[in-house]
């Protein structure tokens, strides 16, 4: 009896794992083995595919074959017993195009209200992704084990920290990789769960802001308790993208080591041009807080995103605010060459109730004011670019009294 060729050959490539699956054509024939040949583009001869010779099952692995993953390859299969079937040719394919990104490796660390996620490619030193290592981005789905309500976080890198979590709570997550340059979305990792710790005695510092004064950067933050010492560290932001490297060499800012105030001042020349992460930690001598949320600090923008300068024209029921370019030292205006949005906060001098206006225009009306009342105003600028998402610090507050009633405009 003539042996029939195997049919329906499927090639599955995940990272550097090359798997072939096929269907037997004739289930009734026993003790059949299968063998594959391969042929590279531009070659006439067929070569035996190592790892896929005389296979008794309907699956084989040819990962050991050192292929150029960007080069087209053709496969053929036949069945063998006493005689052999005719060859069945598989459509040619390029391994890189066919490859899927496998599940990444995930390593979790817990704090009281945060989880640090370290992500590595599933295959270390992968040949398939050798040229794309730095292009991987990741997305994750996280949920409280008790509720199952999922939150998705997109476009993260090999280290990501999730804040504002609840202490002593189990969170679960899964991660997948993407190579957006090649339109490839990977497979999810297994689910990993971790429990946040008991609440720490000392909370981390909050609301970290960087501003520029003369030739210095001024770093400010808020803290709950007095009589503390603080330290500030920085890291090049691009290091979070380095696949497989999970040793982050945070560096001290010398002028911000063991400071006793909730701010520190350091020269601009501490940082070369670039994007950095900054974090602050508090200590009372016995206990230490966890690190604050990491803020992104872009020297290019920070150097120019100064608080706006404004004038107020007072009417009986409103203020007209005219926003001008901020002044550098030497009283020269700074040219802002990117679009800004302005946040204006105002309040009655005798009250703490603040109201907010967000405006793109540089002339703003603050309506619904009471006559003969002192109001205070402060403003800050934000970049409109979502990716940069920078804010200046607030300007100093300016207080003005509204005019008596029925003032004509």
């Amino acid at each position: 009896k003539n042996l029939k060729s195997p049919q329906k050959v499927e090639v599955d490539i995940i990272d550097d794992n090359f798997i072939l699956r096929w269907n037997r054509s004739d289930e009734s024939v026993g003790n059949v083995t299968f063998s594959f040949d391969y042929q590279k583009t531009g070659m006439d001869n067929w070569i035996k595919l190592s790892g896929c010779q005389n296979i008794t099952s309907t699956k084989c692995n040819f990962s050991s074959l050192k292929l150029n993953v960007y080069e087209e390859i053709k496969l053929r299969i036949r069945a063998e017993k006493e005689n052999t079937s005719s060859w069945y040719e598989v459509d040619s394919f390029t391994p890189f195009r066919k490859a899927q990104i496998g599940p990444p490796e995930v390593h979790l660390e817990a704090e009281d209200k945060a989880i640090v996620i370290h992500i590595s490619p599933g295959t270390k030193d992968s040949v398939m992704w050798a040229l794309d290592g730095l292009s991987f981005t990741y997305s994750l789905v996280i949920w409280k084990n008790s509720s199952g309500v999922e939150e998705r976080i997109e476009n993260i890198y090999s280290r990501h920290k999730i804040y504002k979590l609840s202490p002593e709570t189990t969170y679960c997550l899964k991660v997948k990789a993407a190579l957006l340059t090649s339109w490839k979305i990977g497979v999810y990792s297994p689910v990993h769960c971790i429990k946040t710790t008991v609440e720490n005695e000392l909370p981390p510092p909050e609301n970290i802001e960087v501003s520029v004064q003369n030739q210095n950067y001024v770093l400010k933050w808020d803290y709950t308790y007095a009589n503390m010492t603080f330290q500030v560290q920085w890291l090049h932001a691009f290091l979070k993208r380095n696949p497989g490297n999970h040793l982050y060499k945070w560096k001290q800012i010398p002028d911000c080591e063991n400071v006793k105030t909730t701010q520190c001042v350091f020269p601009q020349n501490v940082f070369q041009k670039g994007i950095y992460l900054l974090r602050v930690q508090a200590s009372d001598g016995n206990n230490t807080s966890f690190w604050s949320e990491e803020i992104k600090f872009d020297t290019e923008i920070q150097a120019f995103l100064l608080p706006p300068v404004f004038n107020i024209r007072s009417l009986s029921d409103s203020f007209h605010i005219y926003i001008g370019a901020p002044k550098q030292s030497g009283n020269t205006p700074v040219i802002q060459d990117y679009p800004l949005i302005y946040e204006i906060i105002f309040w009655e001098n005798t009250s703490n109730a603040e109201r907010k206006i967000i405006e793109k225009k540089t002339d703003v009306t603050v309506p619904n004011l009471k006559p003969l009342t002192v109001y205070c105003v402060k403003a800050r600028a934000h970049t409109m670019d979502e990716k940069l998402n920078k804010s200046s610090v607030f300007s100093d507050a300016v207080c003005e009294k509204t005019k008596p009633g029925n003032t004509s405009k």
């Epitope: 390593h107 979790l108 660390e109 817990a110 704090e111 009281d112 370290h118 971790i194 710790t197 008991v198 720490n200 005695e201 490297n245 999970h246 040793l247 060499k249 560096k251 001290q252 016995n286 206990n287 230490t288 966890f290």
Partner: antibody
């Protein structure tokens, strides 16, 4: 493969100084932290300090600050521990260790016994 | 400095036994704890890092758990080669500190 090879045993007099070396191979020391750990005879492990060979930044345990200096020579992939004003309680085995992913001391040298004796 | 207190300091035990070693930190260190094994005359060897991650090549009978201030190393079924001294270490803050060690002896 990753290896840390330390210099040989030393016998030194009280008040003197000693410099112990640790040569790394199979990895680039600039990409890691390098730590030193003390173990007195029959005692536990004590962290002395670490260096970032890339920029020579150091951290020391307060107990050792001032009497200990950690340095690195990236051209020879070697880190050094210098102990000064030695006293009998400095008699110990001193280990170097590599600080790798997740800040773990993942590879250790074989240890160097320093004996302080008159 | 963060103090780490291990218990017990000594343990007489037999092959096949399940062994639990605990490590208490004087303040919250998250999951930043490492466990080492040291045999006489040898350098320490990492077993567990980040409280619960087993190093590649370490037998599955070793497991770690805990977070915050309380951590545990479990050896599910003691083997002859496991008689050694075990140390916990925190890597949350400088200076890094070690527990005083737990010595496992053959009963």
């Amino acid at each position: 493969q990753v290896q840390l090879v330390q210099s040989g045993a030393e016998v030194v007099k009280p008040g003197a100084s000693v410099k112990v070396s640790c040569k790394g191979s199979g990895f680039n020391i600039k990409d890691y932290y390098m730590h030193w750990v003390k173990q007195a005879p029959g005692q536990g492990l004590e962290w002395i300090g670490r260096i970032d060979p890339e920029d020579a930044e150091t951290k020391y345990a307060p107990k050792f600050q001032g009497r200990v200096t950690i340095t690195a020579d990236t051209s020879t992939s070697t880190v050094y521990l210098e102990l000064s004003s030695l006293r009998s309680e400095d008699t110990a085995v001193y280990y170097c260790a590599r600080g790798g992913n997740f800040y773990v001391m993942d590879y250790w040298g074989q240890g160097t016994l320093v004996t302080v004796s008159s | 400095d963060i103090q780490l207190t291990q218990s017990p300091s000594f343990l007489s035990t037999s092959v096949g036994d399940r062994v639990t070693i605990t490590c208490k930190a004087s303040q919250n260190v998250g999951t930043n704890v490492v466990w080492y094994q040291q045999k006489p005359g040898k350098s320490p060897k990492v077993l567990i890092y980040s409280a619960s991650y087993r190093v590649s090549g370490v037998p599955s009978r070793f497991s770690g758990s805990g977070s915050g201030t309380e951590f545990t190393l479990i050896i599910s079924s003691l083997q002859p080669e496991d008689f050694a001294t075990y140390y916990c270490q925190q890597k949350n803050n400088y200076p890094y500190t070690f527990g005083q060690g737990t010595k496992l002896e053959i009963k």
